[in-house]
């Protein structure tokens, strides 16, 4: 059985506006006040089991009272009223939950979507958050016949029960509403064929040509709601590798189409397509993109051809000589297909000329000492490039004209060459280079330039602190000029060691000192200067630099018949590095003298 | 500069023989192999025969095999070829052609020429 309560507070379901002030009042039972022996003065109100302070309580009349509260912005508050029995013993009447939030704000950019077999989805801004249980309905009608509500679970949007009817305008608006009011969005008015977003397109093919290496072919199937609609595209593709897409001008895909043919592509390059669509008039959305599909374009003829040098060996005997022929894989982007061979076509004048078909980038030949010319073209499934054509003339033939002003840098963690081109017009620049050794021979690596560079940068992986010695040789009609070298650093370190000092003549009062050089392996940079420190056991120690070209340095001034301790330092462009220390004693008389 | 001069060609009969030269100068005739071609009436140029620079190793078509005989005497920078057991279908324009390497190769591929006049071979009953 339940107990009767003593009183009850009224309103009973509060719902307060936030930052606006609310009172709420306890009415006790006749009943009651006789059996307690109180009256209204007698209660106590709390808010969270926390006592509301006197000010905010008036007492009414012997059986009522209210509390009053200010700027209300806790969203929810157990107000509960009690009474002091016996005037110690709390007791409690009656309680209620009152809630605080705002009425809702009238819904706003109401849009609605037709996903290609789905029903309608609309969905709107509900404005600022209400803190309250807010319903909201979609509504929608035809100028003659309303649809069923659809209530919202979200708040932001709702699925509508019932198909779309395409090509006959539907009114559609939101209505919210909780315990604080009720508001109406701006209703939209709308033919539901131009909100549809289609599925996206499917099948999706790539085909290349044999005729085109520029071109590929698109087809695929779309649907628009079973070919009610006709749809315009959007193609998009990207290189195998690459991040960013492409754009195929959209005015190229207006018309409806399930086919499309892709131009200006590169040969033999894996390019990956998506398409998707929209009603042609463009109202609507745009579908969600396709699966991705990929194709490669066919090969090409390779548009150049390898770079080209060669090498002699010394001769052996007076009159042959081995050549070796050296070239450069060509990158695919020049190579247009995978390279099957290379063709080497050796002539002379007034000679049979003989051609090699050689797979690997190399070919070695003996050959008199004649002139000679040599031509080389790379060959894929399509065809064959252009031929690069060497001179390689009599090995009595003194090389004229060579490059000037050569340098080398490092920048941006490259090693950069430049020089000033000979006086004769160049066919093109070779430029070679190995790490400088005395522990391992001089591998080189080599490039080949155009007739107008005079600047690049080393196109190898280089080592730091390893010395690299470069040469650039112009190349001419008549065959290579004169070659030009340098050594050079990508970046400089401290010498791995220091030199080793050693006398070489002692006196009574000088002493000369030796060294060698440190060998290239453990320079780490160009020896730029040298510092000698020497001392006595008590002295204070002296410093003196020396250039880096001596390899001896006399010491003066010294005193006679005393233990010298001596210590070498190398330095580079980034630092110094001490060799072991040296000891030696001057003699206490000089040669011939007596004491 | 190369200079090629052929003589020895004639009017002979079928079965009949012949012995070909080549007069070599403007260059070290025996740093080079050297080749034999012909032209027939009508036709493209058909390789002959060659040999290498020393002379010691020797090459043939094989409508020639065994009926011509190639050889060289590089003290004289003379290049000869023996024709024997002549047929009607050896009635052509034949040419002595520098390689451009001590060695002939039958693997490699060669473009052939005729820089020098030739001598015309005849062979008729």
């Known amino acids: 059985q339940l107990l009767e309560p003593c009183g009850y507070i009224y309103p009973e379901f509060p719902v307060v506006q936030r930052g606006s002030n609310f009172t709420a009042i306890c009415v006790l039972k006749e009943a009651c006040l006789q059996h307690y022996y109180v009256n209204a003065s007698y209660i106590v109100w709390k808010t969270n089991h926390a006592a509301v302070p006197r000010e905010q309580v008036t007492v009414i009349n012997r059986t009522t009272s209210s509390v009053t509260f200010t700027d209300v912005v806790l969203p929810s508050v157990q107000l509960t009223c009690n009474i002091l029995s016996f005037g110690q013993i709390e007791q409690n009447v009656y309680g209620v939950t009152m809630l605080s939030g705002f009425p809702p704000d009238k819904p706003t950019n109401l849009t609605c979507i037709v996903n290609e077999g789905k029903n309608m989805l609309c969905q709107w801004d509900p404005g600022r958050e209400t803190y309250l249980e807010t319903n909201y309905t979609l509504k929608s009608e035809w100028a003659t016949e309303k649809f069923p509500d659809c209530q919202s679970k979200h708040g932001t949007s709702c699925m509508v029960s019932y198909m779309p009817t395409y090509y006959v305008n539907i009114e559609v608006w939101v209505e919210a509403e909780n315990a604080l009011g009720k508001v109406s969005s701006e209703s939209i008015n709308f033919d539901p064929v131009d909100k549809v977003k289609p599925t996206p397109p499917y099948n999706l093919s790539v085909t290349n040509s044999e005729e085109l290496s520029s071109i590929l072919k698109l087809s695929w199937v779309s649907s628009g709601l079973g070919g009610l609609l006709d749809l315009k595209s959007d193609i998009q593709y990207r290189t195998k590798d690459a991040s960013t897409w492409i754009q195929v001008p959209l005015e190229d895909t207006m018309s409806p189409r399930t086919s499309f043919t892709v131009q200006d592509l590169k040969p033999f390059t894996e390019y990956v397509f998506r398409i998707r669509s929209i009603k042609d008039s463009g109202k609507g959305y745009w579908s969600d993109w396709s699966e991705e599909a990929s194709g490669t374009t066919y090969e090409d003829r390779p548009s150049r051809p390898p770079s080209f040098w060669y090498k002699t060996n010394p001769s052996h005997g007076q009159e042959y000589r081995s050549v070796r022929l050296i070239w450069k894989a060509l990158p695919l982007s020049e190579a247009n297909g995978k390279i099957l061979d290379y063709e080497v076509i050796l002539t002379q004048s007034k000679s049979v000329s003989q051609t090699y078909t050689v797979t690997g980038t190399e070919l070695t030949v003996n050959l008199t000492n004649d002139r000679y010319v040599a031509s080389l073209a790379a060959r894929n499934k399509v065809g064959k490039s252009a031929a690069a054509v060497l001179t390689i003339p009599s090995p009595h033939v003194t090389a004229a004209y060579s490059v000037v002003n050569l340098k080398a840098f490092p920048k941006d963690n490259l090693l950069w060459v430049e020089w000033t081109p000979p006086p004769k017009p160049v066919s093109k620049y070779i430029l070679e280079w190995c790490v400088l050794s005395e522990n391992a021979p001089c591998v080189e690596d080599w490039q080949q330039e155009d007739a107008t560079v005079n600047r690049t940068h080393l196109r190898g992986r280089l080592l730091e602190s390893k010395c690299y010695q470069i040469t650039v040789t112009p190349v001419f009609a008549t065959g290579p000029g004169g070659s030009e070298s340098l050594k050079a650093y990508l970046k400089q370190a401290a010498p791995a060691r220091g030199p080793t000092v050693r006398t070489k003549k002692v006196g009574k009062n000088e002493a000369v000192l030796a060294w060698d050089q440190i060998p290239v392996d453990d320079q780490n940079g160009f020896i730029r200067n040298y510092s000698i420190s020497y001392r006595t056991s008590v002295g204070k120690e002296m410093v003196v630099h020396v250039d880096s070209s001596h390899t001896e340095y006399t010491l003066s001034s010294l005193s006679s018949d005393t233990l010298y301790m001596v210590r070498m330092a190398a330095y580079t462009d980034e630092g110094g590095k001490d060799g072991p220390e040296f000891t030696f004693t001057t003699p206490k008389f000089a040669q011939g003298e007596i004491e | 500069q190369v200079q090629l001069q052929e003589s020895g060609g004639g009017l002979v009969q079928p079965g009949g023989s012949l012995r070909l030269s080549c007069a070599a100068s403007g260059f070290t005739f025996s740093s080079y192999a050297m080749s034999w071609v012909r032209q027939a009436p009508g036709k493209g140029l058909e390789w002959v025969s060659a040999?290498?620079?020393?002379?010691?190793?020797?090459y043939y078509a094989d409508s020639v095999k065994g009926r011509f005989t190639i050889s060289r005497d590089n003290a004289k920078n003379t290049l000869y070829l023996q024709l024997n057991s002549l047929k009607t279908e050896d009635t052509a324009m034949y040419c002595c052609a520098k390689h451009i390497t001590g060695d002939y190769d039958p693997s490699l591929r060669y473009e052939y020429n005729c820089w020098g006049q030739g001598t015309q071979v005849t062979v008729s009953s």
């Open positions: 040999i290498n620079s020393g002379g010691g190793s020797t």
